[in-house]
């Protein structure tokens, strides 16, 4: 008996061939001997089966002695043995229909788990193997689970169902809802305008939800909500914003915040959360602000940074085109009695300058 695997919702074509290459009478029945489909001349005839409006054939093939049974919009319960009767002979085909679906939704938040469930006909014992977009393989029986979804899990999952040495392939598009970056650092000189951007790693037609930016300033004892906003069909509207600092927010995606001035009291780290409509859980992105200030007070030239810096960052003071006068893994450096000229304060990581502030020291008479 020939075995054919089908996918729920798809179309399958079961073949039946006569030795005579001409249009002759045929009919297809199910295992209960209920007539599904046959022919009379150039026309199709249909029996009282459940497949009535989903069964078809190809009249163009009849005169070649081919009498296929086409079943559209396959259902699991279409799994059965189908019998083609033609020229006093019977051809049997066993059809097994499988379905593979994602647990709730194919749009999942980063960190959530994905469960794929296999629907299969009674008596079958299939095995399933799925390959994620990043090439990770998972195997299982009726259910497959992947915990802690990552951004790289977004894309097409290819799942192969094996039964009777035959296989059928499913493709499921999974969208992991997340920000493009989990964390970002903005380095600014005191007084500069600060731009915070929170690009999303996915695109959906309609995006609705609400969000908030909480800020923990380095100098403050507790965190504070800087701004709350709503998102409706990709349009952003501010609900509430603090007086200090007075943040501005872009009206369109990607989420964009502007801080008029970088000041030492704002240096710190923030957490932007976005709650999407009809989703449990929130999207998070951490953002950090490092502020630099270079000052000269009497005979003391000082360079300071505020905010979350890594211990391996180097802070240096140097006269233009000269070697660094002072260079330390600290958040403040100074030079006493600096000579006249253009001094540079540099914050660098392994030789790469992250932030630079220039200050002119005038000659003392």
């Amino acid at each position: 008996k020939k075995v054919v695997l089908g996918k729920k919702g798809d179309t399958v074509e079961l073949t039946c061939t006569a030795s005579q290459k001409k249009s002759i009478q045929f009919h297809w029945k199910n295992s209960n001997q209920i007539k599904i489909l046959g022919n009379q001349g150039s026309f199709l005839t249909k029996g009282p089966s459940k497949l009535n409006d989903r069964a078809d054939s190809r009249r163009s093939l009849w005169d070649q002695g081919n009498f296929p049974l086409i079943i559209k919009n396959l259902k699991i319960e279409d799994s059965d043995t189908y019998i083609c009767e033609v020229e006093d002979q019977k051809e049997e085909v066993q059809l097994l229909v499988f379905g593979l679906t994602a647990n709730s939704d194919t749009h999942l938040l980063q960190g959530q788990s994905l469960t794929l469930t296999l629907e299969s006909p009674p008596g079958s014992s299939p095995s399933v193997q799925c390959r994620s977009p990043r090439g990770k393989n998972i195997q299982g029986g009726k259910t497959l689970s992947v915990s802690q979804l990552e951004l790289q899990d977004s894309g097409t999952w290819t799942c192969t169902v094996l039964q009777n040495q035959k296989k059928v392939e499913f493709k499921i598009d999974i969208v992991v809802l997340a920000f493009q970056k989990a964390s970002s650092i903005v380095y600014k000189k005191e007084g500069e305008q600060v731009e915070f951007s929170f690009p999303l790693a996915f695109t959906v037609e309609k995006l609705t939800g609400s969000g908030e930016l909480w800020w923990q300033a380095e100098r403050a004892s507790s965190s504070k909500s800087w701004i709350t906003f709503d998102l409706k069909n990709k349009e952003v509207s501010v609900k509430r914003v603090t007086q200090d600092p007075k943040l501005q927010m872009g009206k369109k995606l990607p989420l964009h915040l502007t801080l008029p001035q970088a000041l030492p009291q704002y240096a710190g780290s923030g957490n932007l959360t976005l709650a999407l409509e009809a989703k449990t859980g929130k999207l998070h992105q951490e953002v950090n602000l490092v502020v630099m200030r270079a000052t000269q007070l009497q005979k003391n030239l000082t360079c300071e940074v505020w905010g979350p810096t890594s211990p391996k960052l180097m802070l240096s003071l140097k006269l233009e085109n000269k070697e660094a006068k002072v260079s330390k893994r600290e958040k403040a450096v100074w030079v006493l009695n600096p000579e006249a000229g253009m001094w540079q304060c540099l914050l660098s990581d392994s030789g790469q300058v992250l932030l630079e502030s220039n200050i002119k020291v005038l000659p003392t008479w």
């Epitope: 026309f43 009535n52 989903r54 163009s60």
Partner: antibody, heavy 121, light 108 residues
């Protein structure tokens, strides 16, 4: 050109039979079905059945089974439809139409002008 | 048997207007098996469309067929004087072949 020429109008009494002919020309008669469709005055079209001129195989709707006979004479490229046990509701125009099977498509592309059959006592 | 229902029964329009005729099948059929015919008073029907959307030989482009499943449509983009007639849809998904009751397109 391709055409189907039908026999003339008939007036019949209830219980009688009528035989309508349909002569094909301009194409190979045995390559296409001949379908029979009727239309009562002011009413819609009603398909009755068909004959395959090549094999002689026929088929008709359940409504007419036992009362309708569809035949053909290939030597004169003519198809016939005979309806017996006539009743007044069989009063209608009877059309023959060529049935074309092109790939998976089937359609009636050439029609006769129709034969009026009146059943009246 | 599959019952074909056409609507509206009558459509009153002026030349140049767009006509939209509907045909609904009592069960889902493949678009392969849907034809449209035109019939003028005292004449035999004439094939317009087969396979739901393929125009028959010599049929002007203003006639357009569409649809799938149970709902099919014949659209005449700009009615010409010669288009005022009765239009029938017909299925050959399986025996018996059945016609719709027809839609009469008349001059307003």
């Amino acid at each position: 050109q391709v055409q189907l020429v039908q026999s003339g109008a008939e007036v019949k009494k209830p219980g009688a039979s009528v035989k309508v002919s349909c002569k094909a020309s301009g194409y190979t008669f045995t390559s296409y079905d001949i379908n029979w469709v009727r239309q009562a005055t002011g009413q819609g079209l009603e398909w009755m059945g068909w004959v395959n001129p090549n094999s002689g195989n026929t088929g008709s709707t359940q409504k007419f089974q036992g009362r309708v006979t569809m035949t053909r004479n290939t030597s004169i490229s003519t198809a016939y439809m005979e309806l017996s046990s006539l009743r007044s509701e069989d009063t209608a125009v009877y059309y023959c139409a060529r049935g074309v099977l092109k790939g998976d498509y089937y359609y009636m592309d050439v029609w006769g002008k129709g034969t009026t059959v009146t059943v009246s006592s | 048997e599959i019952v074909m229902t056409q609507s509206p029964a009558t459509l009153s329009l002026s030349p140049g207007e767009r006509a939209t005729l509907s045909c609904r099948a009592s069960q889902s059929i493949s678009s392969t098996y849907l034809s449209w015919y035109q019939q003028k008073p005292g004449q035999a029907p004439r094939l317009l469309i087969y396979g739901s959307s393929t125009r028959a030989t010599g049929i002007p482009a203003r006639f357009r067929g569409s649809g799938s499943g149970t709902d099919f449509t014949l659209t005449i983009s700009s009615l010409q004087p010669e288009d005022f007639a009765v239009y029938y849809c017909q299925q050959d998904d399986h025996l018996p072949l059945t016609f719709g009751g027809g839609t009469k397109v008349e001059i307003k």
